[in-house]
């Protein structure tokens, strides 16, 4: 591209070229993929509603937990055991969470009366011990309550501890009470307020509207906008037995997704609830099942401090608001409809590729011979070659060869190193199709040439005989008519090509070859065709009129204007061109590739 | 689960060497602090030698010097190389596992019984000349 553009360049339009291709099975291709993409886009235009632009909520949610709870505990006082009845109420079950969530006591264990002393550890396998071996001075292991002595005292009857400063008695470790001392915290309910903000589309709503009965219970389908939900029915909507979660306690996910159109004509905002178990409950037992949590209750009894240690397990609920607010926007519908254009394109991309695929060499040497049915087919061959233009990368070693008795064209893309052209095999390439329209513009007296005597009015292209060998003839020649190459030794096997592949006849003794390539009537009406007022001297108009009858050798041999400027002429073709139209002085120069 | 076979025992005279080996099931091995026990008749169970998963080592105070333990992971064994052997070292040996997957054994823990979860059925050996 040049480096410097004037305003004309600027101001232009480049366009593509098409093939129209009339075909009943490639039209119904075509409607096919146009009317099934057309319904797609649509039907995910509306569903989606791609045309909103959709905005994620902010929320803040409140929750009120309501209930009561009567509690058997079992404790021993004096070495007997007693059941003592207890109320709880939402002070003594609720605990204050941060973020979106709220917790329930559902179990508990306690360790009354702890003080500050040193008393012997709970046996467990990491704190018996057999001496004071067993146990090291200032040890504080993770899972021990206290600081180790560093001796060995009885804990209770024969079995020895490791003694440590620590709250005494130590927390027994034990597993939680079954049923969970709380079980009838399934009844409990739960209030939970959700304000939600869309600023984008500045809407506000919550889920609480102001005609609601505040004496509803959720149920997922007789009251799926009610904002107070029982316990134990979170559980069931999950699969889950809240006596069972209960003793060991568990996390639960309470989801509230909010799904709003806020167009006009189709407005709806409001919070669909869902209900997920969230903690792992097939965690085995040392890896630490359920939820909890320990906290004291401080107290002084005689000037000592002293506190009350609960276990607490229980269920942490953890509010989950989620969703979009959407609404129409001119914008995102362009950047849709823009982004869905590009499927209109399928058709295309597969009908191209059936052409290709059906217009294979595959196909033409593999299937067509021997599927009948697939016959049809063959059509793909002339809808490619009219939609295809191939061409080669004109490579320096690029050249074209066509012999009088061969139908194709050979390509030789190769360097010769040092053998005749004549003899290199090269690559079969079909002779483009004869465009007659040309002959159109040669002048009258080409078309109506009168019949020479002694030669029959019909089409004779060659004489039969072959013309003898000469004695100068080189090897490579086949008519008799070639000469050895005057270029230099290196350049020489580019010139060694005869006009056929085997003996016979040549082309130069053709009538054709005649009026064709070497009548100076039809080579100068050619030059003054492309310029009219041409004038020159002998010898420029020599060299003019050679090269003009090598361009129509080559023109009227290959064809196609790509193939005619790589071809090499036959030895004796050119040989007779510079015999008619020779050079008053120098050497000829041979082909030169033109780029 | 962890199951412990020891091998090697028998009868030997003073002073010379025997080799006993523990050989353990579960592809879990490496996680195990393994140690050696022995019992003579009518004592309590004694410490001889453990191996943290790690490869720390602890011996009893009548052995050390004399007894060697080792381990091999790929192997799933825990040898006890005993040299200089004495007619005091007359007892059943016994062969025990302590999980380490949560946590690792105190090095000054490696010695207590209560420690070790695991426990195999014992080898004679008999020092006398």
């Known amino acids: 591209m040049p480096a410097c553009c004037s305003c004309s360049d600027v101001f232009q339009y480049e366009t593509n070229k098409v093939t129209r291709i009339q075909s009943m099975n490639y039209g119904t291709i075509k409607w096919f993929f146009h009317v099934i993409i057309f319904s797609y886009v649509c039907f995910a235009l509306v569903s989606d509603k791609l045309y909103q632009r959709k905005e994620p909520v902010i929320s803040s949610v409140h929750t009120k937990v309501k209930g009561i709870a009567e509690v058997k505990e079992e404790i021993v006082e004096n070495g007997v055991k007693k059941l003592v009845h207890s109320v709880f109420d939402t002070a003594d079950y609720t605990f204050p969470l941060q973020g979106n969530s709220f917790f329930v006591m559902t179990n508990f264990l306690k360790t009354e009366g702890q003080e500050q002393r040193l008393c012997p550890e709970y046996p467990t396998r990491r704190t018996l011990c057999s001496s004071d071996r067993g146990c090291k001075k200032g040890w504080m292991d993770p899972q021990s309550k206290g600081i180790q002595t560093g001796r060995c005292v009885v804990y209770e009857g024969n079995q020895k501890t490791c003694e440590v400063s620590a709250w005494c008695p130590i927390e027994a470790v034990e597993e939680a009470p079954r049923p969970a001392l709380l079980n009838s915290a399934e009844n409990f309910t739960v209030l939970i307020k959700n304000n939600i903000d869309f600023p984008g589309h500045n809407y506000t709503t919550r889920n609480i509207l102001p005609g609601l009965n505040i004496t509803c219970t959720f149920h997922k389908t007789q009251n799926p906008q009610c904002p107070i939900f029982r316990l134990g029915d979170i559980f069931r909507e999950t699969g889950d037995n809240f006596s069972d979660v209960a003793i060991q306690g568990g996390i639960m996910g309470i989801e509230i997704y909010w799904d709003c159109n806020l167009d006009r004509w189709f407005h709806h905002c409001r919070p669909k609830y869902s209900f997920r178990r969230l903690d792992d409950k097939t965690t085995n037992v040392s890896l630490y099942p359920g939820y909890n949590f320990r906290y004291a209750k401080y107290y002084k009894e005689n000037n000592v401090e002293k506190r009350t240690l609960i276990k607490v397990f229980g269920i942490r609920f953890d509010i989950l608001v989620f969703g979009t607010g959407g609404k129409f926007d001119i914008i995102q519908l362009v950047v849709y409809i823009g982004s869905t254009l590009s499927y209109f394109g399928l058709a295309a991309v597969f009908i191209d590729f059936l052409i290709d695929t059906y217009s294979s060499n595959c196909c033409r040497s593999h299937i067509y011979p021997w599927c009948k049915c697939c016959q049809p087919c063959v059509v793909n061959e002339y809808y490619y070659r009219k939609k295809c233009e191939s061409i080669v990368e004109p490579k320096p070693t690029l050249k074209y060869v066509s012999f009088v008795d061969e139908s194709h064209i050979r390509m030789v893309n190769q360097q010769l190193l040092g053998r005749s052209l004549q003899d290199v095999k090269g690559q079969e390439v079909p002779r483009p199709a004869m465009d007659f329209t040309d002959l159109s513009r040669l002048p009258l007296a080409l078309h109506d040439t009168p019949p020479i005597p002694g030669q029959p009015e019909e089409i004779q292209l060659l004489r039969k005989e072959a013309t003898p060998r000469s004695r100068d003839s080189p090897v490579w020649c086949q008519c008799g008519s070639c000469l050895p190459s005057q270029l230099p030794e290196s350049h020489r096997c580019l010139e060694e090509l005869c006009c056929r592949k085997k003996p016979g006849a040549c082309i130069t003794t053709s009538e054709l070859f005649r009026k064709l390539v070497l009548s100076r009537h039809v080579l100068q009406f050619l030059l003054l065709y492309q310029e009219p007022l041409l004038a020159l001297d002998v010898d420029s108009t020599n060299s003019r009129l050679r090269h003009c009858a090598y361009r129509c050798y080559a023109t009227w041999r290959f064809g196609s204007q790509d193939m005619a400027d790589f071809a090499i002429l036959p030895s004796c073709c050119r040989w007779r061109i510079r015999k008619e139209f020779p050079k008053s002085e120098g050497q000829y120069s041979g082909f030169k590739s033109p780029y | 689960e962890v199951q412990l076979v020891e091998s090697g025992g028998g009868v030997v005279q003073p002073g010379g060497s025997l080799r006993l080996s523990c050989a353990a099931s579960?592809?879990?091995?490496?996680?195990?602090?393994m140690g050696w026990f022995r019992q003579a008749p009518g004592k309590e169970r004694e410490f001889v030698a453990a191996?943290?998963?790690?490869?720390?080592?602890d011996y009893g105070d009548s052995v050390k010097g004399r007894f060697t333990i080792s381990r091999d992971d790929a192997k799933n064994t825990v040898p006890l190389q005993m040299n200089s052997l004495k007619p005091e070292d007359t007892a059943v040996y016994y062969c025990?596992?302590?999980?380490?997957?949560?946590?690792?054994?105190?090095?000054?823990?490696?010695?207590?019984?209560?420690?070790?979860?695991?426990w195999g059925q014992g080898t004679l050996v008999t020092v006398k000349s």
């Open positions: 191996i943290s998963s790690y490869g720390s080592t």
């Open positions: 579960g592809r879990t091995f490496r996680h195990y602090a």
């Open positions: 025990a596992a302590a999980d380490e997957t949560l946590g690792a054994v105190p090095n000054f823990r490696l010695h207590e019984k209560y420690e070790y979860e695991y």
